[in-house]
């Protein structure tokens, strides 16, 4: 048996993936647990095995179909249950009626590349991955640049309030190594959150030309 409080949080990536984390304060023995998704108006249901990510939390990804297929719409409600095996039976540990498009977290942006670099500026582009066509252009981005001697947490956030998949970084120092990350968030959804940060893109500004003011 399990005592203590539990928290069950899930996000939809807007296409074919629901990622869930279940946290349980009470001690769990070596019990097999899973998340079960049952849409209210679809012919399919889906299950994933919860795997430990820390002492008291477990995570899994419900793969609903091909990565770019639109498996749920804004009208769908999905009943999500955490089920844990107790002997020969499954016990419901947590349950929620999940509105996918109110609980969005997109995939991290991909394909970051330097379009053009100079001594003091750098133009960078990226792509969004597995994002629904429903959003049209109504997405926003946050970006950050890691400077030498600083941490990511210290990096100021740059906000792009529209679907703009590029940025021109200004006032950089010549001949300096930087790293860059970006994340994305739809405007839609009361409990929508930012995507994970993209993989960092490393780049170096060009050296200042000798004998010239820069």
């Amino acid at each position: 048996a399990v005592n203590g409080t539990s928290q069950f949080t899930c996000f939809y990536n807007s296409r074919a993936n629901i990622s869930c984390v279940w946290s349980q304060d009470g001690a769990l023995q070596d019990t097999s647990c899973q998340v079960h998704a049952w849409p209210d108006r679809r012919r399919w249901n889906q299950t994933c095995e919860l795997l430990p990510v820390s002492q008291a939390s477990w995570a899994c990804n419900l793969i609903l179909g091909a990565p770019d297929s639109q498996k749920l719409t804004t009208v769908d409600i999905v009943t999500l249950r955490v089920l844990c095996r107790e002997g020969v039976r499954w016990r419901v540990m947590a349950i929620q009626d999940f509105k996918p498009f109110e609980n969005l977290r997109l995939m991290a942006p991909i394909s970051l590349q330097v379009v053009h670099v100079e001594t003091h500026r750098c133009n960078i582009s990226w792509e969004i991955s597995q994002a629904s066509h429903y959003f049209e252009r109504h997405l926003e981005f946050e970006a950050r640049t890691l400077s030498p001697g600083h941490t990511w947490e210290e990096a100021p956030l740059l906000t792009l309030k529209q679907k703009q998949e590029w940025i021109c970084l200004e006032t950089l120092t010549p001949d300096t190594q930087y790293e860059f990350q970006v994340r994305v968030k739809p405007l839609q959804g009361e409990f929508t959150t930012w995507s994970p940060w993209s993989q960092p893109l490393a780049f170096r500004t060009k050296p200042a030309a000798l004998g010239k003011d820069t």
Partner: antibody, heavy 117, light 107 residues
Framework: EVQLVQSGAEVKKPGATVKISCKVS????????IHWVQQAPGKGLEWMGW????????EYAPGFQDRVTITADTSTDTAYMELSSLRSEDTAVYYC??????????WGQGTTVTVSS | EIVMTQSPATLSVSPGERATLSCRAS??????LHWYQQKPGQAPRLLII???QSISGIPARFSGSRSGTEFTLTISSLQSEDFAVYFC?????????FGQGTKLEIK
């Protein structure tokens, strides 16, 4: 430039069926969602339904579900709305519009349908 | 279904003045509220999404705000082209529903 061009005005008898077309340009029709909205004379707007061309799915408002059919022809970039069993209360302007599911970003010019015996 | 109530039905304001239009939802709709403008003989035009996000190309004098289930569209300094009917629409609960409209007329 995004454009939605609707077919012309229609006069129909009660009990008949009307089918309105909405020809789009300026965006990728195959990855779009097209809504239909009714506006009766002197009244507000009423959302009727949508077709999601990528998912191949339709959604209808309960008040229209039994009588409306929304289709699309991706070879001609045209959406259609068919309303059957017409009655006098269906006299209205009907709009097609492109958007995400939640709001309507671009609208057609409207098609007037008059139902009269 | 959710009922959207707009007030007032008609609002008379002088050019250059501020106009405040209200839209109330019959239940909580988070920020899933959108505003449209419709001029006579024309289709509606999307102005603001999610209560307060302006659509690109819409003049900065149009702004939106929310307090609970009450949403407000403010036009800071009315221009002659702003006199029209304004509709709100919710997208929180299916089916989507519109308010009955507020007619903004010249005083």
């Amino acid at each position: 430039e995004v454009q939605l061009v609707q077919s012309g005005a229609e006069v129909k008898k009660p009990g008949a069926t009307v089918k309105i077309s909405c020809k789009v340009s300026g965006f990728n029709f195959k990855y779009s969602l097209i809504h239909w909205v009714q506006q009766a004379p002197g009244k507000g707007l009423e959302w009727m339904g949508w077709i999601d061309n990528e998912a191949g799915e339709t959604e209808y408002a309960p008040g229209f579900q039994d009588r409306v059919t929304i289709t699309a022809d991706t070879s001609t970039d045209t959406a259609y709305m068919e309303l059957s069993s017409l009655r006098s209360e269906d006299t209205a302007v009907y709009y097609c519009a492109r958007g995400g599911p939640w709001f309507l970003s671009y609208w057609g010019q409207g098609t007037t349908v008059t139902v009269s015996s | 279904e959710i009922v959207m109530t707009q007030s007032p039905a008609t609002l008379s304001v002088s050019p250059g003045e501020r106009a405040t239009l209200s839209c109330r939802a019959s239940q909580i709709i988070s920020n899933n509220l959108h505003w449209y403008q419709q001029k006579p003989g024309q289709a509606p035009r999307l102005l603001i999404i999610y209560g307060l996000q302006s659509i690109s190309g819409i003049p900065a004098r149009f702004s939106g705000s929310r307090s609970g289930t009450e949403f407000t569209l403010t036009i800071s300094s009315l221009q002659s082209e702003d006199f029209a009917v304004y509709f709100c629409q919710q997208s929180n609960n299916f089916p989507w529903t519109f308010g009955q409209g507020t007619k903004l007329e010249i005083k």
